[in-house]
């Protein structure tokens, strides 16, 4: 009976440790500044790195600038967005600013987009200053599915910060749905 | 073998608990406002309370302004700062202020410190209103590895607002890593 | 002894299902906008949704505009606030405005409120730009015990975006109190 | 090279006015808040005022307050400081200081000249 | 008003010695003391700022320290050309308070 007792220990051990890990998927994808599009109006961030630097995915899908869930459960998104602009840039179109990010949900079943979180401001960025910043953060815990995306879209993407300490977004799974 | 069954579930539940409680360091550590660094240029907040108030602390270390990892994990870290001018307060000398937070990595064996996460915003703060105030909140999911420093940089440290809810920092585990 | 090495595992699973489900309570709550308090000065919030859209709660309760925790433990808190003004909406009392979130704990034993977290901005919206827009992010990681009450206090609730992904707040369960 | 010039330094009598000005070159002048301060004859050094870089702020010790008014051009990159009710006490020779330090903490890093002021009947 | 005591208002000293200047503030300013030199017919120039930071361009024999009340300045290995009037200054509130200065004199 030892001996057994010492089996179902172990191979609860594995079970624990193998169930822990496949039920927290997670990734942590940083702004790739090699792509990002011009002009001022709301577009979707497409180009995102998954594997350099404090970038990270695990058990979740990066594919055609979206973060594919694999498992259903409760997750935990963020998002931070910087944005930013030096005189040496050169001017701005316009001195007033509307400087947003939409973190969005797609299901494929319902081809639908919705915005799950949103956050910025309006800013008034005079040339009075030589150097211009703005950070926007937002988080929220989400029941995602199977198959669903989540991606990301902000407005005045000309103006992002491309440093992978600035402008990233993630998400971790919490737990499972009942 | 009922007997034995029983005495598998209580060492179970025993290992479970254990292993839970072992594997979820956190820590929420609150501004020491008794000694802010004066100076506008980035500095690191070395003191914070770490067990009074919110504060508090369980399976990392804090020492020398640091908080230090001691078990291997992915954390979910996350930073509160917030700035803040009454004209009572003290002396501006510019209305254009760039109020910034840094979340830092040095690793012991390469001495080099790594910026996790930044945020803020430059502002113009003028005469014409008696009061001003800002807050930035940064957050994010990192590997950490034992012996791994966390440490807050900021610009304008004498602008801090020195409540427990207002400026702050903390991380906790979220898993283990593969 | 296979079999009950069997029943075993099979009332682990069980056992480990229902204690993890049991152990994390959580909660996305989104800004009911029927009912939002007039006037520029600090308000609760007491109309959220709990069950429609994002909204939703599980192993913790909401109720007169207070999420109130069922479960002792340590938990992630979170709040999103968006303020917004459009020119057609009228003319503001003020073009200087301060927008603040405050992240209350109010313990039924003891009837007093703290402040766990504080967030936001001043900010002058002036009359040359027809839209403004601002969003306040916070988040942090709080004891909490069975019976206490969480609830956001803001200014100037009038200017709230009344959408589920502008307003909300939320928190879910990370781990037991040793 | 940051360059800051003052004059307007003169020989005034008691209940006088004078207005000194600070020409500021080789910086942005519109980021910088400024500062006068002076050195009395006995070689001690004493603020005397304080404009901010919009000159939105201001700021007096006591010893000044309602007699002396400091202003800025940032257009024309110059500091000015406007003295009336002149004192005996108020012979100095006068600096221009920039400041750095963008929050309470400020300090002078960029100091004139100089100009001379003697109040004397 | 934060009165800056500097003790000596006279110090002398030779070339290659260390010295260290020492200034007292009448209330706790956490580390915001300037240090500023003085040449003869020459204006004051910045050396250290926030008790410790060097300022740009200030050679690194010139260093300070203090926190709270207590400040020093030091020269670690005096030269000819430091001959000149050293003073401290709070820069934690208004109003902006200097030491009476200290003149170095080289002999």
């Known amino acids: 009976i030892r001996a057994e007792k010492a089996m179902v220990d172990g191979s609860w051990l594995d079970l624990a440790k193998r169930s822990k890990l496949e039920a927290q998927p997670f990734a942590h994808l940083t702004i790739n500044a090699t792509d990002i599009p011009s002009g001022s109006h709301k577009v979707s961030l497409s180009s995102w790195y998954h594997d350099r630097g404090w970038a990270k995915i695990s058990n979740m899908t990066f594919s055609n600038g979206k973060l594919i869930v694999n498992q259903d459960g409760f997750y935990y998104l963020y998002a931070n967005i910087c944005f930013r602009h030096h005189e040496t840039s050169g001017d701005l179109a316009t001195e007033y600013l509307q400087l947003m990010v939409y973190v969005t949900k797609t299901s494929i079943k319902i081809p639908s987009s919705h915005t799950l979180m949103k956050g910025g401001s309006t800013k008034y960025w005079s040339g009075n200053s030589e150097f211009h910043f703005y950070s926007i953060n937002v988080g929220g815990f989400f029941k995602l599915r199977s198959g669903e995306e989540i991606s990301i879209e902000v407005s005045n993407p000309s103006l992002l910060d491309p440093d992978q300490d600035a402008t990233y977004f993630g998400a971790f799974k919490v737990r499972d749905i009942d | 073998i009922r007997a034995e069954k029983a005495m598998v579930d209580g060492s179970w539940l025993d290992l479970a608990k254990r292993s839970k409680l072992e594997a979820q360091p956190f820590a929420h550590l609150t501004i020491n406002a008794t000694d802010i660094p004066s100076g506008s240029h980035k500095v690191s907040l070395s003191s914070w309370y770490h067990d009074r108030g919110w504060a508090k602390i369980s399976n990392m270390t804090f020492s020398n302004g640091k908080l230090i990892v001691n078990q291997d994990g992915f954390y979910y870290l996350y930073a509160n700062i917030c700035f803040r001018h009454h004209e009572t307060s003290g002396d501006l000398a510019t209305e254009y202020l760039q109020l910034m937070v840094y979340v830092t990595k040095t690793s012991i064996k390469i001495p080099s410190s790594h910026t996790l996460m930044k945020g803020g915003s430059t502002k113009y703060w003028s005469g014409n209103s008696e009061f001003h105030f800002y807050s930035i909140n940064v957050g994010g999911f990192f590997k950490l590895r034992s012996g791994e420093e966390i440490s807050i940089e900021v610009s304008n440290p004498s602008l801090l607002d020195p409540d427990q809810d207002a400026t702050y920092f903390g991380a906790f585990k979220v898993r283990d890593i593969d | 002894i296979r079999a009950e090495k069997a029943m075993v595992d099979g009332s682990w699973l069980d056992l480990a299902k229902r204690s993890k489900l049991e152990a994390q309570p959580f909660a996305h709550l989104t800004i009911n906008a029927t009912d939002i308090p007039s006037g520029s000065h600090k308000v609760s919030l007491s109309s959220w949704y709990h069950d429609r859209g994002w909204a939703k709660i599980s192993n913790m309760t909401f109720s007169n505009g207070k999420l109130i925790v069922n479960q002792d433990g340590f938990y992630y808190l979170y709040a999103n606030i968006c303020f917004r003004h459009h020119e057609t909406s009228g003319d503001l009392a003020t073009e200087y405005l301060q927008l603040m979130v405050y992240v209350t704990k109010t313990s039924i034993k003891i009837p007093s409120s703290h402040t766990l977290m504080k967030g936001g901005s001043t900010k002058y919206w002036s009359g040359n730009s027809e839209f403004h827009f601002y969003s306040i992010n916070v988040g942090g990681f709080f004891k909490l015990r069975s019976g206490e009450e969480i609830s956001i206090e803001v200014s100037n609730p009038s200017l709230l975006d009344p959408d589920q992904d502008a307003t909300y707040f939320g928190a879910f369960k990370v781990r037991d109190i040793d | 090279e940051v360059q800051l010039v003052e004059s307007g330094g003169d020989l005034v009598k008691p209940g006088g006015s004078l207005k000194l000005s600070c020409a500021a070159s080789?910086?942005?002048?519109?980021?910088?808040?400024m500062s006068w301060v002076r050195q009395t004859p006995d070689k001690r050094l004493e603020w005397v005022a304080t404009i901010s870089s919009g000159g939105s702020y201001i700021y007096y010790p006591d010893s000044v307050k309602g007699r002396f008014t400091i202003s800025r051009d940032n257009a024309k990159n110059t500091l000015y400081l406007q003295m009336s009710s002149l004192k005996s006490e108020d012979t100095a020779m006068y600096y221009c200081?920039?400041?750095?330090?963008?929050?309470?903490?400020?300090?002078?890093?960029?100091w004139g000249t100089g100009t001379t002021v003697t109040v004397s009947s | 008003d934060i009165v800056m005591t500097q003790s000596h208002k006279f110090m002398s000293t030779s070339v290659g010695d260390r010295v260290s200047i020492t200034c007292k503030a009448s209330q706790d300013v956490s580390t915001a003391v300037a240090w500023y030199q003085q040449k003869p017919g020459q204006s004051p120039k910045l050396l250290i700022y926030s008790a410790s930071y060097r300022y740009t361009g200030v050679p690194d024999r010139f260093t300070g320290s203090g926190s709270g009340t207590d400040f020093t300045f030091t020269i670690s290995s005096v030269q000819a050309e430091d001959l000149a009037v050293y003073y401290c200054?709070?820069?934690?509130?208004?109003?902006?308070?200097f030491g009476g200065g200290t003149n170095l004199e080289i002999k």
């Open positions: 080789g910086f942005t002048f519109s980021r910088y808040g």
């Open positions: 200054q709070q820069h934690y509130s208004s109003p902006r308070t």
């Open positions: 200081a920039r400041l750095d330090g963008y929050n309470y903490r400020w300090y002078f890093d960029v």
